[in-house]
């Protein structure tokens, strides 16, 4: 978002085109109330930053978040009998990038056809409430299951009906929360015309009056609590998982649970790195040097770091992969175009010479009991 | 060089209009803006609109239903139209040049142009 | 509607002079201040832009300082061909010029 210029002589600057134009002179419009930008905001607005890179990055986004999250939530929900905390935490991560994901034609068009946004106003505050939701929600549902893991090698005991009620009384508390700190981006106008480029945008740009104080404190205010704070208790989880790890036992079966345990905090270190830390970093940068300069220097960074950001609903399957024995399956035979009845018959003759599943998979495998760290 | 050439003098009675003509050399419209301001005798100056290169028009609210601001771009030439003259309209008017953007200044004006409204 | 105050409304001073003109603005408006002369019969002509920003051709005893509220030109030693009158015009919100600044010779 970029500061943008009230040229109306009186009111608010949160209208950007009010009702769209009052008449039409020659071959342009006469606009009521106007947003200008400054020369670099117009350069990166047109450029083949935000019209051919954001797309190629969605698209690619589109591809893998929709069919792996789909699979996914379908797994957790339909084919994972005993629905364990890790379980109800992915599925609601798996719906939180769905929910985000199933916008992004929208997004895609919005970007290649020049940041023009022919939606309407309510379509584009839902994907921008949902784009910035699915942030929050995949944050706080990554610490739920960070804590968790490390919680299940502290008390390696069986599941319980009372643990997954308080996972489903948390994830129910964490949307409540998210539906509450993106209210402000839901009733805030986004859809602003801007005359000298002839195009309306999503949020791109914001009205200069609403963005001096109140967008950099609710983003740093997001950033301290709903970004830092779990990305705190993330790294504790995962400092002390290691710790753990390090003096358990070693044996063939622990081994892989320790290698598996690994790739899983790499894989959330890398969607941190990647997706969360730039991202919430640049927020609150970026609407810092608006607030005290009155332009960004950082808006080519901050359209980036936010694209990246969406890049956490691509990485989530590889979570669920490392953590979920039934959705590791299910992917496995996906990309082998196998279904799992069909392997499931076949192991049916070794499964008398392997060790039980019952002892030996990971967590949140159906028929689990023991952990898998 | 970049330059703005503006029509003579006018003088209007009541109620009537006035077109002012301002032709762009040097550059073009299709890439700048161009502004109108306009200066009572001994008074400061004002702004009263502007039209894009893409055609997009603003127009200040004291006289926005008065002003029409038009561009030919065959012939590189903007206009401001400006209707129900009383004789408060009794100003010199201005254009000038604007590339559009919020960081920049209004940088080549015209000569002006003396609308004399006047029953 | 953004107001701005030019003071003094005149300034009366001899060449070779240091001439200090104020523009202030009644609400924040960063570095989006720009600075006219204007002599008698003539159009405006601009001299700084963007608070700080030197137009072409403008000789360098003009500057320009300030931002958010307060802004100033200042001519370091006034030539005979500076006297004039300066308007400010601010572009953060909407086009508002000063009332104006006569500098006029002692």
């Known amino acids: 978002t970029i500061q943008g210029t009230n040229r109306s002589s009186k009111g608010r600057s949160l209208i950007g085109k009010v009702d769209g134009t009052s008449h039409v002179t020659g071959k342009g419009v006469t606009v009521e109330t106007v947003f200008s930008v400054d020369e670099f905001s117009a350069s990166v607005l047109t450029g083949k930053l935000t019209t051919v890179f954001l797309p190629i990055v969605y698209t690619i986004v589109f591809v893998v978040g929709l069919p792996s999250n789909g699979m996914a939530l379908w797994v957790f929900l339909f084919r994972t009998k005993k629905k364990h905390p890790a379980v109800i935490y992915m599925a609601n991560l798996a719906l939180a990038d769905l929910l985000s994901v199933i916008w992004f034609p929208l997004k895609i068009a919005y970007h290649i056809h020049g940041n023009n946004w022919i939606y309407g106003e309510a379509l584009c505050n839902v994907l921008i409430g949902f784009f910035y939701g699915n942030m929050y929600c995949s944050i706080l549902f990554m610490t739920c299951l960070s804590v968790q893991r490390y919680w299940v090698i502290v008390n390696p005991m069986g599941h319980s009906r009372k643990k997954a009620n308080i996972a489903i009384g948390i994830s129910l508390a964490i949307w409540l929360l998210i539906l509450l700190v993106t209210i402000p981006l839901y009733v805030v106008k986004q859809t602003i015309f801007i005359p000298a480029l002839n195009i309306t945008t999503c949020h791109d740009v914001l009205p200069e009056q609403l963005l001096v104080g109140d967008m950099f404190n609710y983003f740093l205010s997001l950033a301290i609590g709903v970004f830092l704070f779990p990305a705190f208790l993330t790294a504790s989880a995962y400092v002390l998982m290691i710790r753990m790890l390090r003096s358990s036992a070693m044996d063939e079966n622990s081994e892989k649970k320790r290698k598996r345990a690994i790739k899983l905090i790499v894989t959330v270190l890398a969607m941190y790195l990647i997706c969360f830390t730039p991202s919430n970093l640049l927020l609150v940068v970026h609407y810092f040097l608006i607030k005290s300069q009155g332009q960004s220097h950082v808006y080519a960074l901050y359209i980036v770091a936010l694209c990246l950001s969406t890049l956490n609903s691509c990485i989530d399957p590889f979570v669920y992969y490392f953590v979920s024995h039934d959705f590791r399956d299910h992917a496995k035979n996906a990309l082998l175009c196998r279904s799992v009845r069909t392997v499931k018959q076949m192991q049916v003759s070794l499964t008398s010479k392997k060790h039980s599943r019952k002892s030996s998979s990971y967590s949140s495998s159906s028929t689990t009991v023991k952990t898998s760290y | 060089q970049v330059q703005l050439v503006q029509s003579g003098a006018e003088v209007k009675k009541p109620g009537s209009s006035v077109k002012v003509s301002c032709k762009a050399s040097?550059?073009?419209?299709?890439?700048?803006?161009v502004i109108w301001v306009r200066q009572a005798p001994g008074q400061g100056l004002e702004w009263m609109g502007v039209?894009?290169?893409?055609?997009?028009?603003y127009y200040a609210q004291k006289f926005q239903g008065r002003v029409t601001i038009t561009a030919d771009e065959s012939t590189s030439t903007a206009y401001m139209e400006l209707s129900s003259l009383r004789s408060e309209d009794t100003a010199v008017y201005y254009c000038?040049?604007?590339?559009?953007?919020?960081?920049?200044?209004?940088?080549?004006w015209g000569q002006g142009t003396l609308v004399t409204v006047s029953s | 509607e953004i107001v701005l105050t030019q003071s003094p409304a005149t300034l009366s001073l001899s060449p070779g002079e240091r001439a200090t003109l104020s523009c202030k603005a009644s609400?924040?408006?960063?570095?989006?201040l720009d600075w006219y002369q204007q002599k008698p019969g003539q159009a405006p002509r601009l001299l700084i832009y963007?608070?700080?920003s030197l137009a072409t051709g403008i000789p360098a005893r003009f500057s320009g300082s300030g931002s958010g509220r307060d802004f100033t030109l200042t001519i370091s030693s006034l030539e005979p061909e500076d006297f004039a009158v300066y308007y400010c015009?601010?572009?953060?919100?909407?086009?508002?010029f000063g009332g104006g600044t006569k500098v006029e010779i002692k």
């Open positions: 000038a040049r604007w590339r559009g953007y919020k960081d920049y200044p209004f940088d080549y």
């Open positions: 040097g550059f073009s419209l299709s890439s700048y803006g």
């Open positions: 039209i894009w290169g893409n055609g997009n028009t």
């Open positions: 609400q924040n408006i960063y570095k989006y």
């Open positions: 963007n608070a700080n």
């Open positions: 015009l601010q572009h953060n919100s909407g086009w508002t």
